[in-house]
Interface confidence: low
């Protein structure tokens, strides 16, 4: 649709509350270092301007694009050059180059202090004193730390955040009510951010064909009763929504997402029997519910795929007529029959099928050539099946913390050039796959595990792209989206790596260790473990286990001592010397 005033159109469609929230998120994701008050001021100015355009769409500047309006507003920030350096040069560009420039300067790892949670009473007072500001601050703090967070979903998180405070600040035991809810929102929020980051990376690095393929596979698993045409329509619409959000077009994205939810709820009969309970909910909750909806039951009478995709004499004719659509239909048919496969595996199978057709349709006897194509799938299917089986066995044997440590060692040996904080963060998250997926029934393990690993490895790729240090990581991250996980799995010990010189300072600990939370203690120990492996990449599991056991004993001993700092000062050098000897 063309509108005289895009800003008026979106304001009317979204309503003032969502409009203001989305503009705040957009600005916070672009200018991640700006103080809260500065963003609130900019948002209020944009909102007032939008209201003048609603009153008169012909008013001055109301016909400008949203990128022009928002970019002009961001470029008025007084401290742009000193705060953001070369990002200020974006303001010298014209649209659309200016917006592209802002997007390129989004920082996935901004230098911002970790969010500290105040006392419950302090938070409840702030909530009651000024609820609107309290919620805006939440949007701002999350958005600036997660510059690709799915904006309409962040509004849903903010609504849940508000509901938690509204309920718990009146409870007898405020903390018991509130803290578990905040923990849940934090964990879900981090997961949501990481999943969206993969969608944006898929679109930005591999193009919308890659994203559409992912969406065809995933939606076909979710909606196996839907016709291919219906799935195709949903894929096209979903691609538009995510392209907009990943491109910073948050108002259009939220508007189109609402339209998609409306369409799905109006067409439930031709999509899925599972949508009903989602469709009774209010907008934000409805969209979230639809995105997370469980897979519908598979139709009982699905015929074998071989007839249309192997045995038919028209395979090459159909493929040649419309390659992407034919492959799309193959992917749809395969995915709807295999909710037990990961999306990434399904995409690998479609790629293998495509490669076979490319080769065979040029052969003297195409049918003879591609007759055994399904046999070629077997090793592709078995590889993730075996990987999940082995890692779940290891997880069950070790427990989460030690499983994380095994992965830390494994990944540090593969890519020792990667920074220690990144290796710790990524390996800890890889290790969470155990608790998340290994308890599930067999049929759900692979889709859970491999698709989760894809999200975590994307985080490694995104961080590595900012500061590239390893050709192996670059290769695995850029060559093929669907083969990223197998590429990392296949990496061996990096023989070319020159071990890091021993630095006693890295292994010097103080009494503050004793006051850390269990999670923070684990991170300290895991940081030391990575540094050990970087120093001695060929150390055996037994050697590393011995050193880590000694470390745990040393910390426990000193944390029980009367003079903790003196104990660390005395026992620390002994621990270091013993560790060096053990690894010699």
């Amino acid at each position: 649709d063309t509108h005289k005033s895009e800003v008026a159109h979106r304001f009317k469609d979204l309503g003032e509350e969502h409009f203001k929230g989305l503009v705040l998120v957009a600005f916070s994701q672009y200018l991640q270092q700006c103080p809260f008050e500065e963003h609130v001021k900019l948002v209020n100015e944009v909102t007032e301007f939008a209201k003048t355009c609603v009153a008169d769409e012909s008013a001055e500047n109301c016909d400008k694009s949203l990128h022009t309006l928002f970019g002009d507003k961001l470029c008025t920030v007084a401290t742009l050059r000193e705060t953001y350096g070369e990002m200020a040069d974006c303001c010298a560009k014209q649209e659309p180059e200016r917006n592209e420039c802002f997007l390129q300067h989004k920082d996935d790892n901004p230098n911002l202090p970790p969010l500290v949670r105040p006392e419950v009473d302090v938070m409840c007072t702030a909530f009651h004193d000024n609820e609107a500001t309290f919620l805006k601050k939440y949007l701002y703090e999350v958005a600036r730390r997660h510059p690709y967070f799915y904006a309409p979903e962040l509004l849903f998180f903010a609504a849940r955040y508000k509901a938690a405070f509204a309920e718990c600040c009146q409870a007898a035991d405020k903390a018991a009510c509130l803290l578990p809810k905040l923990d849940e929102l934090r964990d879900e929020g981090k997961a949501s951010s990481a999943k969206q980051r993969l969608k944006c990376a898929s679109l930005q690095k591999f193009g919308d064909r890659a994203f559409k393929a992912w969406a065809v596979a995933r939606l076909s698993q979710k909606f196996p009763k839907a016709e291919f045409a219906e799935v195709s329509k949903l894929v096209t619409d979903l691609t538009k929504v995510h392209t907009e959000c990943c491109h910073g077009d948050l108002l259009e994205c939220a508007d189109d997402r609402a339209d998609l939810a409306k369409y799905m709820c109006e067409n439930q009969d031709s999509i899925s029997s599972k949508l009903k309970e989602c469709c009774d909910k209010p907008l934000l909750e409805k969209s979230h519910c639809l995105a997370e909806v469980e897979n519908d039951e598979m139709p009982a009478d699905l015929p074998s795929l071989a007839a249309d995709y192997v045995e038919s004499k028209d395979v090459c004719k159909n493929y040649a007529e419309a390659k992407d659509v034919f492959l799309g239909m193959f992917l749809y048919e395969y995915a709807r029959r295999h909710p037990d496969y990961s999306v990434m595996l399904l995409l690998r199978l479609a790629k293998a099928y495509e490669a076979t057709l490319e080769k065979c349709c040029a052969a003297a006897d195409p049918h003879e050539c591609y007759a055994k194509v399904f046999d070629e799938f077997q090793p592709l299917v078995e590889e993730p099946q075996n990987l999940v089986k082995q890692n779940c066995e290891l997880f069950e044997q070790l427990g989460e913390y030690k499983f994380q440590n095994a992965l830390l060692v494994r990944y540090t040996k593969k890519v020792p050039q990667v920074s220690t904080p990144t290796l710790v963060e990524v390996s800890r998250n890889l290790g969470k796959v155990g608790a998340k997926c290994c308890k599930l029934p067999e049929a759900k393990r692979m889709p859970c595990a491999e698709d989760y690993l894809s999200v975590v490895l994307n985080r490694l790729c995104v961080l590595h792209e900012k500061t590239p240090v390893s050709e192996k990581v670059t290769k695995c991250c850029t060559e093929s989206l669907v083969n990223r996980r197998p590429c990392f799995s296949a990496l061996e010990l990096d023989e070319a790596y020159v071990p890091k010189a021993f630095n006693a300072e890295t292994f010097t600990f103080h009494a503050d260790m004793c006051t850390l939370s269990e999670k923070e203690k684990q991170v300290k120990k895991q940081t030391a473990l990575v540094e050990l492996v970087k120093h001695k990449p060929k150390a055996t599991k037994e050697q590393l286990k011995g050193v880590m056991d000694n470390f745990a004993a040393f910390v426990e001993k000193c944390c029980k001592a009367d003079d903790k700092e003196a104990c660390f000062a005395e026992e620390g050098p002994k621990f270091v010397a013993a560790s060096q000897a053990a690894l010699a």
């Epitope: 291919f228 045409a229 329509k233 096209t236 419309a322 659509v325 799309g328």
Partner: nanobody, 115 residues
Framework: QVQLVESGGGLVQPGGSLRLSCSAS????????MGWYRQAPGKGLELVAS???????HYADTVKGRFTISRDNSKNMVYLQMNSLEPEDTAVYYC?????????WGQGTQVTVSS
């Protein structure tokens, strides 16, 4: 690459009829939506009529009972039969076809209803 070409537009008197045609060339397989949109001078783009993969149709309130959309699957053609034309129907008419590959638009054909 898919190309859409509209034809059949022109000048017609109020109460008259026109039949618009839209043909698609290139790889356009697995179509799920075909539609006609129009844009009058100084106005936004509006949906006139659409037809889905299963043949179900949708019409704007302003054209119901006067316009009929149809398609020929074998030829990748979509038609718009316009009867009882009114001056308010004056606009550029665009054809839109959607498949898994994307959303494809024609260049438009001018329809002018005037005495």
């Amino acid at each position: 690459q898919v190309q859409l070409v509209e034809s059949g537009g022109g000048l017609v008197q109020p109460g008259g009829s026109l039949r618009l045609s839209c043909s698609a060339s290139g790889s356009i397989w697995g179509i799920y939506h075909m539609g006609w949109y129009r844009q009058a001078p100084g106005k936004g783009l509006e949906l006139v009529a659409s037809i889905t993969v299963d043949g179900s149709t949708h019409y704007a309130d302003t054209v119901k009972g006067r316009f009929t959309i149809s398609r020929d699957n074998s030829k990748n053609m979509v038609y718009l039969q316009m009867n009882s034309l009114e001056p308010e129907d004056t606009a550029v008419y665009y054809c839109d076809i959607r498949n898994v590959g994307g959303d494809y638009w024609g260049q438009g054909t001018q329809v002018t209803v005037s005495s």
